[in-house]
C-alpha cells in the first residue's frame, strides 16, 4: 500500500539538493581559501540534520545552530550590503565592488540561494513533491527559518555604515514584512551600527521623482531612528550607470549624478 | 568520465580578440568552478582566473585584468575566455583546467589545450 | 602574489635512481601545494595534492611531503616514463602560482 504523503502547496525541494549543496560548499572554499578548513561533508550531514526526519512546519532556529557553528565566517562588519526586492543587482555590485558582502556572499547563503528543500516528519526521505508555502502553509518551515537564522546572524554582525539596496519600482519599497523588515532591521545592533543607508534604485529611464520621499521610506526610517541608528537615502536613477561607474570611478561621466 | 575539450588552434594578427572555448561532459557543469591556465612556448604554468558558472561570478589574476573576460553558457555546459588587445606575448597555450572531489584544490582535469598565435 | 621557487631547473639521472625536486614557497601555503607531471604537447597531469596525497592512479614511486614553507617531490625509482617537466602549484591563496619547472632527463 502507498504510504500517504502530506501535499503542500509549495514546490518540492530542488532536484540534487545533497549535490548541489555539497557542489557549492567545495566551490565556495576553492573561491574563498579563508574558508579551506571547512568540511565540507559536515557541512551537508549538519544541513541534513536540521529539517530530516522533522515536521516541516515545526523547524525551529535550534535546529540550524551545527549548521551555523560550522559555517561561522567573519566578514568585514563595515562592509555590508543588505537588500531587499533586487537580489541581482544588489549581486552584481558585489561582484564588482569586492571587499563589500550581501548575504550570499557568505558561505551559508551562498549554500541556500534560490534553493528549496524539506523533509517528512519521521522518515529520512527529502520531500522532492512539495513543501510548505511561508503563507498558506506555515511559516516555521526550513527554508523559511534557514532564512531567518541567517539573516538575523548576518545584521547582527554589522557595523558602522550598513547599506540597503531597496526597489523602486515596487508598490512598498521597504515591506515590513520582507526578511529585510522583519528579521534584518530589527536586529542592526545601535551601539554598533552607526548609520543605515538606503539606495533606492529606479526602474523607469526617466523615472526622475525623489523616491526617498516614499511613505514607506519614511516608515523605514522612521523604525531605524527609534532604534537610535541614523538614516541616509539615495536615488540610483540609472542602475546600468550605476554598476558601470563603480567598474570605473575614473570615467567623465561618474560625476554627475547616477 | 570527466572531459573537457576546448576548441582547435588560432592565428590572430596584434590587436585582435580570441575567443577559446572549453566544453565540458561527464559532470554537472555548474558544480564545479572552471580556471585558465595560460602556458608560453617552452615556458612555465600561470593561472589566469575562474569562473563559478553556476552564478556567473568570475576572477581575474591581476596581470590578465582589463583584457580576459572569462564567461560560461550553462545552457551548452560550456566555458569561454577571451582575450583582447593581442600582443605576440600572448602567443601560448591556453588550458581549462578543474578540480574534483577527492583531490583538495589542485586541478585533476584539463582541457587539451588551445594554441594561439599572435603574429602580423 | 606567492612565489614558488623550484629547484633544480633541470637534472638527470639513471633509471632506478630517486630522484628530489624542491618547491619554497615565498609565504606560508600550509599543506596547499600539488605536484603536476607534463610531456611535451600535453596537459599537466595531477600527480600529488595537498603536499603529499597520491592522486588516483598515480603510481607509488611518486611522493611528496613538506608543509608551511619547504616542500619535496620525490620520484623513488626513476623510469623511463617519468621523462617530463615537473611544477610545483600553491592553491592556498588567490592567485594560484606554479613554480617555473624541473625537466627530468635520462642519463
Known amino acids: 500500500v502507498p504510504r500517504w504523503r502530506q501535499q503542500w502547496s509549495g514546490p518540492g525541494t530542488t532536484k540534487r539538493f545533497p549535490e548541489t549543496v555539497l557542489a557549492r560548499c567545495v566551490k565556495y572554499t576553492e573561491i574563498h581559501p579563508e574558508m579551506r578548513h571547512v568540511d565540507c561533508q559536515s557541512v551537508w550531514d549538519a544541513f541534513k540534520g536540521a529539517f530530516i526526519s522533522k515536521h516541516p512546519c515545526n523547524i525551529t532556529e535550534e535546529d540550524y545552530q551545527p549548521l551555523m557553528k560550522l559555517g561561522t565566517q567573519t566578514v568585514p562588519c563595515n562592509k555590508i550590503l543588505l537588500w531587499s526586492r533586487i537580489k541581482d543587482l544588489a549581486h552584481q555590485f558585489t561582484q564588482v565592488q569586492r571587499d563589500m558582502f550581501t548575504l550570499e556572499d557568505t558561505l551559508l547563503g551562498y549554500l541556500a540561494d534560490d534553493l528549496t528543500w524539506c523533509g517528512e516528519f519521521n522518515t529520512s526521505k527529502i520531500n522532492y513533491q512539495s513543501c510548505p508555502d511561508w503563507r498558506k502553509d506555515c511559516s516555521n518551515n526550513p527554508v523559511s527559518v534557514f532564512w531567518k537564522t541567517v539573516s538575523r546572524r548576518f545584521a547582527e554582525a554589522a557595523c558602522d555604515v550598513v547599506h540597503v539596496m531597496l526597489n523602486g519600482s515596487r508598490s512598498k519599497i521597504f515591506d515590513k514584512n520582507s526578511t529585510f523588515g522583519s528579521v534584518e532591521v530589527h536586529n542592526l545592533q545601535p551601539e554598533k551600527v552607526q548609520t543605515l543607508e538606503a539606495w533606492v534604485i529606479h526602474g523607469g529611464r526617466e523615472d526622475s521623482r525623489d523616491l526617498c520621499q516614499d511613505p514607506t521610506i519614511k516608515e523605514l526610517e522612521s523604525i531605524i531612528s527609534k532604534r537610535n541608528i541614523q538614516f541616509s537615502c539615495k536615488n540610483i536613477y540609472r542602475p546600468d550607470k550605476f554598476l558601470q561607474c563603480v567598474k570605473n570611478p575614473e570615467d567623465s561621466s561618474c560625476t554627475s549624478e547616477i | 568520465e570527466v572531459q573537457l575539450v576546448q576548441s582547435g588552434a588560432e592565428v590572430k594578427k596584434p590587436g585582435a580578440t580570441v575567443k577559446i572555448s572549453c566544453k565540458v561532459s561527464g559532470y554537472t557543469f555548474t558544480d564545479s568552478v572552471m580556471n585558465w591556465v595560460q602556458q608560453h612556448p617552452g615556458k612555465g604554468l600561470e593561472w589566469m582566473g575562474w569562473?563559478?558558472?553556476?552564478?556567473?561570478?568570475?576572477d581575474v589574476a591581476e596581470k590578465f585584468q582589463g583584457r580576459v573576460t572569462i564567461t560560461a553558457d550553462t545552457s551548452t555546459d560550456t566555458a569561454y575566455m577571451e582575450l583582447s588587445s593581442l600582443r605576440s606575448e600572448d602567443t601560448a597555450v591556453y588550458y581549462c583546467?578543474?578540480?574534483?572531489?577527492?583531490?583538495?584544490?589542485?586541478?585533476?582535469?584539463w582541457g587539451q589545450g588551445t594554441t594561439v598565435t599572435v603574429s602580423s | 602574489d606567492i612565489q614558488m621557487t623550484q629547484s633544480p631547473s633541470s637534472l638527470s639521472a639513471s633509471v632506478g635512481d630517486r630522484v628530489t625536486i624542491t618547491c619554497k614557497a615565498s609565504q606560508n601555503v600550509d599543506s596547499d601545494v600539488d605536484w603536476y607531471q607534463q610531456k611535451p604537447g600535453k596537459a599537466p597531469k595531477l600527480l600529488i595534492y595537498k603536499a603529499s596525497n597520491r592522486y588516483t592512479g598515480v603510481p607509488s614511486r611518486f611522493s611528496g611531503s613538506g608543509s608551511g614553507t619547504d616542500f619535496t617531490f620525490t620520484i623513488s625509482s626513476l623510469q623511463p616514463e617519468d621523462i617530463a617537466t615537473y611544477y610545483c602549484m600553491q592553491s592556498n591563496t588567490h592567485p594560484r602560482t606554479f613554480g617555473g619547472g624541473t625537466k627530468v632527463e635520462i642519463k
Open positions: 583546467a578543474r578540480t574534483g572531489y577527492q583531490s583538495g584544490y589542485g586541478f585533476p582535469y
Open positions: 569562473i563559478d558558472p553556476e552564478y556567473g561570478r568570475t
